[in-house]
Structures are given as structure tokens and as C-alpha cells.
């Protein structure tokens, strides 16, 4: 099934001019994501039922091994490249989580809605980051890694991997919002 974010392996050929206050828009989107991250996390683990709500440290701890790194003290260009990688990773992961949750928790409509809304903001953020990288730094291609494919996991693993990812998302988005 299609994932919500397909990164562009492109040369710097931006079809539309970048938004005037691009960095402000990026900051605004990060703040928006940061402001809703905890609510999304709570909504997710509550929807999974036991044993998740009472075992958050064990089942939802942010120990995602292949998560792209971020260095808050880097240059703007370096930070934007790392942000791009993170947003791609989060976008594909969120796509997997949304797909799984539609099967595992078909009636958790508020969770589906919040996952979709988050994916929408990430899509916009990705577009803005790419625009900034292209227009200011002439970076048209960034090597990326994708979130883990949960297709072949059992029910418990699907739920656990989703919870760990959202735990990590909540943690990293706070760092990113602060860094920009």
C-alpha cells in the first residue's frame, strides 16, 4: 500500500517558488507537530489496549535502533539535511502505522484522523525543507532510510513497533522544534 511520503530523488528543479518566510513556516510546522505529539502518543497506546497503557517503558520506549541521527549544534544546512531524513523516516513509519491501525483498530477513528493529520503536516514540512535545501544550498538529493516495514509482523509486534516509533517521534519532535 502507498506510503504517505515519497521523497524526491531530484535535481534542484522547484516547480513553484518557495514560500517567502520558509524557515518561519518550517518552525511553525515543527511547533504544530510538537504540540500534538503527546496527544497522538496517548491516543495510540490507549487504542492498543492492555498490556500497553501499563507497560509504556517496556513496550513504547523510544528505542528505535535505525532512526536517523540529529545534531542540534550543526549548521543550518546540516540540520536541514538531517531533518529531511527524519521526516522521510517518520512519514513512511506513520504510513505503516496508519495501515496497520486501520486493520487492527478499525473503529479507532480519532486515532486514524490524528495519524492522517500528522502525515499531512509532515508532507508539507518535507516539501518546505526540500525547497529550502534547493533554493539556498542547491541540495536536490538526500540519501534516506525508511521506517521499518511492519507488513510481516504479528499483531503484538505491529502494535509494539508503532508504539515505539510514536514514543521516539514524541521525543525527537521536541528536540527538532527547539533546534530550529
Amino acid at each position: 500500500s502507498p506510503l504517505p511520503i515519497t521523497p524526491v530523488n531530484a535535481t534542484c528543479a522547484i516547480r513553484h517558488p518557495c514560500h517567502n518566510n520558509l524557515m518561519n513556516q518550517i518552525r511553525s510546522q515543527l511547533a504544530q507537530l510538537n504540540g500534538s505529539a503527546n496527544a497522538l502518543f496517548i491516543l495510540y497506546y490507549t487504542a492498543q489496549g492492555e498490556p500497553f497503557p501499563n507497560n509504556l517503558d517496556k513496550l513504547c520506549g523510544p528505542n528505535v535502533t535505525d532512526f536517523p541521527p540529529f545534531h542540534a549544534n550543526g549548521t543550518e544546512k546540516a540540520k536541514l539535511v538531517e531533518l529531511y531524513r527524519i521526516v522521510v523516516y517518520l512519514g513512511t513509519s506513520l504510513g505503516n502505522i496508519t495501515r496497520d491501525q486501520k486493520i487492527l483498530n478499525p473503529s479507532a477513528l480519532s486515532l486514524h484522523s490524528k495519524l492522517n493529520a500528522t502525515a499531512d503536516i509532515l508532507r508539507g514540512l518535507l516539501s518546505n525543507v526540500l525547497c529550502r535545501l534547493c533554493s539556498k544550498y542547491h541540495v536536490g538529493h538526500v540519501d534516506v532510510t525508511y521506517g521499518p516495514d511492519t507488513s510481516g509482523k504479528d499483531v503484538f509486534q505491529k502494535k509494539k513497533l508503532g508504539c515505539q516509533l510514536l514514543g521516539k517521534y514524541k521525543q525527537i519532535i521536541a528536540v527538532l522544534a527547539q533546534a530550529f
Epitope: G49, E50, P51, D100, I103, L104, D149, S151, G152, K153, D154, V155, F156, Q157, K158
Partner: antibody, heavy 120, light 110 residues
């Protein structure tokens, strides 16, 4: 008609090897599907042995009793599931069933007729 | 590690009787439980999935209930064709130490 047909069972000595096959017809292995092996010792209950996701990732799962000795695999082009059984023991004697499950793989809605493996 | 315990291991009943079989999981499996019927020399047949959903073509006298750790299969009015062995199966976790199937319940003629 959707069907699973197992083959490859037979008599083997302890420590020996055997490879079971399960040919699927009526559906494609390229779909979002899990294939599994479930066994039943004579006069005993059902025991899950192993599962594999037939999609790209090919995730595999094994019961503790067979881990390190049995290997599950699939050939999507042939629509066939395999179980390579090495270091066989007397307690592996059973009818081996091939079973299929849809996402999220929480129940087996398709079963083969079974093939008998005797380790003696 | 999930352990599945089925009870009773056997039950003697007559045609028309109501039969209830219980399956307990050692930890929560949410509603991911299935029930199968098996007759001698045949492969298992799916009856109920996700604790209470009746598989297509299965008579409505079969019903399932429960969630979390305790589940039941009920045959409201036993028919001659129902004398068989019944198994519960958790579909929540397939880790190497998890028990997937219950031990089985043989329904015999009284």
C-alpha cells in the same frame, strides 16, 4: 478453487533431514499473506511450528521446539512453501499441515490435507 | 510467554445439549482468538475468528465470546455432525516461546 497441497513426508531416521513442500493454487503468494506449518503428533493436539510472511520482507517465526533445526521458506514464483527439517528427532513424528492466514495473520482460514513425517 | 489452557479436555454430551468450552490465555490477547473443529483424519476447520465472528458457512449454533484472557465456544444445540475435537488458537503473538493452540477438547457421545 483455493487449495493447499502438502508433499514430501515419509520415514526418516533420527538425525536425518526432510523437506516438505506446500503448493498453493487459486491465490497468489504475492498478496499480503502469511503461510505456516502446524503439526499434530499421533493422538495429540495441534502445535504451531513456523510461519513466514510471503511479502517482500519475508519475516519468519519459529516455535522453540524447532528453532535452529527447521527452516521455513517460500518461492513466490512457484507459489510454494517449504519446510526444511534437519536433525530430526522421534518427537518430530507428526502430520504436518500447511496453513494460510490473511493480514493481520491472527487465524488460519486455509488448511492443506497434511503429510505424515515419521522419525524412527 | 503466552500459554493457552483449554477446559475441559473432554466432554460427553447428547444430541440437543448445550456445550460450552473455555479457553484461557495466561496474558491478554485482546480479541485475537480463533476456534477450530477437527475430525479424525481431517485437517482443522475454522469456526470462529476474532473471538466472536462466525466463519462463512459455519452453522449459527456455534458462537464465541470473550476478550482479554477468557474465551468461550458455545454449541447451542449439539448435532450428530458436531462430535469432534475443538481447539482454540491465539493469534496475538508468535514469538518462539508462545503457545499458539490450546490443548483441545474432545466432544464425545454420551
Amino acid at each position: 478453487e483455493v487449495q493447499l497441497v502438502e508433499s514430501g513426508g515419509g520415514l526418516v531416521q533420527p538425525g536425518g533431514s526432510l523437506r516438505l513442500s506446500c503448493a498453493a493454487s487459486g491465490f497468489s503468494f504475492s498478496t499480503d499473506y502469511w503461510m505456516s506449518w502446524v503439526r499434530q503428533a499421533p493422538g495429540k493436539g495441534l502445535e504451531w511450528v513456523s510461519s513466514i510472511y510471503v511479502g517482500t520482507s519475508g519475516d519468519t517465526y519459529y516455535a522453540d521446539s524447532v528453532k535452529g533445526r527447521f527452516t521455513i521458506s517460500r518461492d513466490n514464483s512457484k507459489n510454494t512453501l517449504y519446510l526444511q527439517m534437519d536433525s530430526l528427532r522421534a518427537e518430530d513424528t507428526a502430520i504436518y499441515y500447511c496453513a494460510g492466514a490473511d493480514n493481520p495473520y491472527d487465524y488460519f482460514n486455509l488448511w492443506g490435507q497434511g503429510t505424515l513425517v515419521t522419525v524412527s | 510467554d503466552i500459554q493457552m489452557t483449554q477446559s475441559p479436555s473432554s466432554v460427553s454430551a447428547s444430541v440437543g445439549d448445550r456445550v460450552t468450552i473455555t479457553c484461557r490465555a495466561s496474558e491478554t490477547i485482546s480479541g485475537y482468538l480463533a476456534w477450530y473443529q477437527q475430525k479424525p483424519g481431517k485437517a482443522p476447520k475454522l469456526l470462529i475468528y476474532r473471538a466472536s465472528s462466525l466463519e462463512s458457512g459455519v452453522p449459527s449454533r456455534f458462537s464465541g465470546s470473550g476478550s482479554g484472557t477468557e474465551f468461550t465456544l458455545t454449541i447451542s444445540s449439539l448435532q450428530p455432525d458436531d462430535f469432534a475435537t475443538y481447539y482454540c488458537q491465539q493469534g496475538y503473538s508468535y514469538s518462539d516461546t508462545d503457545n499458539v493452540f490450546g490443548g483441545g477438547t474432545k466432544v464425545e457421545i454420551k
